[in-house]
Every structure is written in C-alpha cells, then in structure tokens.
C-alpha cells in the first residue's frame, strides 16, 4: 500500500491533523524533500552571521559572515574573527604579535623573524609586527670600499643578545 505522504512535494508536509493531506509549509519553515511529515524551521542569520541566501519553502537559508569574520565548519556553522596583519587569533580574540614575531596575513599565527646571522648574513631591514626582517649580505661582504651603503643597525633577533 502506497504511503499517501509520499505524494507531498517539497515545500509541503503531510498533515496528520488533516487526514494526511499535503499542507504548505508556513512562513519561516521549509521542506527540501517530498514526503516529509514536518517542515523544518528556517535558519536565522543573525549577529556575526549574514544572510547569503534567503529561506524559501523548499530550501533553508544560507549564512556567511560579516566583514572581519570568516566561515568555519560545514554550512558556515561558525564565524571566526579575521585578525589584522601583525596579529594572531587567540582564545581571547585578536592579539598583537609579540616583539620578534610577525604575521603578514589576516589568518594564521605570529612567526619569529628570520635569524639572519644563522645564514651568516646581516639585517638589512628591521622586522615589524607585520613584516619579517630582510637579510642582506654578510658583514664580511661589506668590507671597506665594497659598498658605499652603510647598513642599518641590526635588529634585535629572537634568541640573540646584541653584540
């Protein structure tokens, strides 16, 4: 015997209170498949969530995140704060990179500046919260007469005390 509810299309539900006739889903609800006995409540995109696609009788609303946040999880289950360059995301929100570290992206963690001296090079441009140091030629390469450019004072590098 065929289930009479199987005739109910998406956007409707099989109404047990009305002799199993197909009733339309009321506003703010949906059924995305036929034969359903209830309509599901539409997702509400509130707070840091923003409506990407409105809910209809046959499909749920889809959310994304307001500027400054990005989606995490299936169907944008959560919005994660985007940090600025020079910051990293901690459990307490966005925090500036500690001295000696940098982050040149809006995601990820702060990373230590390159230790130029490990490669036998000198610091050409000091590091910042947003940018790594730029290593230049080794001090030996900068013998008198080899360059008319005076190198900047070396930046303090993590794990190294000033010479």
């Amino acid at each position: 015997l065929q289930d009479p509810c199987s005739n109910c299309p998406a956007g409707t539900f099989c109404d047990n209170n009305r002799n199993q006739i197909c009733s339309p889903c009321p506003p703010n609800s949906f059924s995305s498949a036929g034969g359903q006995r209830t309509c599901d409540i539409c997702r509400q995109c509130k707070g840091v969530f923003r409506t990407r696609k409105e809910c209809s009788s046959t499909s749920n609303a889809e959310c994304d995140c307001v500027p400054g946040f990005r989606c995490l999880g299936a169907g944008c289950a959560m919005c994660e704060e985007y940090c600025q360059q020079g910051q990293e995301l901690t459990q307490k929100g966005c925090k500036d990179c500690c001295f000696g570290t940098f982050n040149d992206q809006k995601r990820g963690i702060c990373r230590p500046w390159t230790n130029c001296s490990l490669d036998g090079k000198s610091v050409l441009v000091n590091g910042t919260k947003e940018r790594d140091v730029v290593c230049g030629p080794s001090p030996a390469d900068l013998s008198p007469g080899a360059s008319s450019v005076t190198p900047p004072a070396p930046a303090r590098e993590p794990g190294h005390s000033p010479q």
Epitope: T12, P24, P27, N28, E54, C55, S56, S57, T58
Partner: antibody, heavy 117, light 112 residues
C-alpha cells in the same frame, strides 16, 4: 512576463465580488503574489499574500473580509461582503523570488472597485 | 503587527536639491525593507530592496540606508520626474506577528 487584474466594477454593499490576477510568462509555483489596495487619494494597503507553495497569509485587519485563492495561472481575491470603505484600486504584484522574505517588482495596472448603494 | 511609520507626509524641494524620507518600523526588521515610487494613475515601482540595494534600471540618485528599525531614502540632484509619492514596505515575512508586508503611509515629494 506580466500580471493583470480584472473583475473590478460597481457593486452594492454586501454583494460578494471576486477579482482575478492573471499571470503570464512565469509560474505561480515559483513566485509569491500579493494583493494591495489603494483607496482614492490614500496610501497603499497590504491585503494578503499567496506564496509559491500555496501558503496564504492575510493582513491581520482583514479578519475574513477577503479570501485569497490560487490556480495554476491565476490568483483570486474575493471581497466577501463589500462596504463603501472597500472602494479602491486593487493591485496584484509578483515577488522577485521564491523566498519568504521577498519584495515585489512586477505590478499590474490595478482594477477599480466601487462599492455604492 | 509590524507598523511602518513614514515621515514627513509631504516634502517640497527645488530641482537639483536633495530630499530625505524616513521610515520607522515598530520592531526590528533587519534590512528587509523596500522603497517604491508611485505616480498618479500608475502602479508602484520598486526602487530599492534590502534597505540599500538599487533595483534594476533605477538611477543612482536614489539611495537607501538603515537597518533594524530606522531607514532612510535619499533622493539627490532632484529632477522634475521625481515628483511622486514614495512608500516604504517591510518584507520581513517572519516577525513574531507573521504579518510582514506592511506599507508606510507614504511621502509626497513636490519638485519646484
């Protein structure tokens, strides 16, 4: 794509009247349709809506004075017991999409209903 | 029910001027608000939806803003063709009262 209202005429108070909104170029199973009226020299007043899935919702003030119906190509509005206050131009309009929170971007020219004894 | 209150009822401005129309909702409707223009003997014409998105073919002189309960329609560089009555309408289907297509009372714009 178009919507067109018809059925407006002079009626006496208490005589039921049914207005028809005929659509062409699109399917009523994809769009919501609303009825809106405008009394002479007055503002727009929302009467009710029929959604793509057939769900019908009336404005609270309607209280049984109007009944909305739907076929595959028409949407009906019955004025169950007209009074002189129901004298107005009645507009039918189509939604922009099939979502619950939609707006209305395709309107008919309206049909005039005059209720007078 | 959601009640939409529009102010002013009428406003007069010169060609080239700017007009601002306000619309207030009795409860928060997020950005579910549309603006319509209506000229005598014609049906309403959609100008703006989702509070600030310009409808197709509408001049960028029309600007909508606001969210929650307070909304504004601004018409800049007024032209004589802008003389009309303007209505706000909520399209927030699913409020607590499930009555979400109410119109404001309208604002008549007179262009001198």
């Amino acid at each position: 794509q178009s919507v067109e209202e018809s059925g407006g005429r002079l009626v006496t108070p208490g005589t039921p009247l049914t207005l028809t909104c005929t659509v062409s170029g699109f399917s009523l199973s994809t769009y919501a349709m609303i009825w809106v009226r405008q009394a002479p020299g007055k503002g727009l007043e929302w009467i009710g809506v029929v959604y793509d899935n057939g769900y019908i919702s009336h404005a609270t003030w309607v209280k049984g004075r109007f009944t909305i119906s739907k076929t595959s190509t028409t949407v009906g509005l019955e004025i169950t017991s007209p009074t002189t206050e129901d004298t107005a131009t009645y507009f039918c309009a189509r939604s922009a999409d099939g979502s619950w929170s939609t707006y209305f971007n395709l309107w008919g020219q309206g049909t005039l209903v005059t209720v007078s004894s | 029910d959601i009640v939409m209150t529009q102010t002013p009822a009428s406003v007069e401005a010169a060609v080239g001027g700017t007009v601002t129309i306000k619309c207030q909702a009795s409860e928060s409707i997020s950005n579910y608000l549309a603006w319509y223009q209506q000229k005598p003997g014609q049906p309403p014409k959609l100008l703006i939806y989702k509070a600030s998105t310009l409808a197709s073919g509408v001049s960028s002189r029309f600007k909508g803003s606001g969210s929650g309960t307070e909304f504004t329609l601004t018409i800049s560089d007024l032209e004589s063709a802008d003389a009309a009555t303007y209505y706000c309408q909520t399209n927030y289907c699913c409020s607590s009262s499930d009555n979400g297509f109410a119109f404001g009372g309208g604002t008549e714009v007179v262009v001198k």
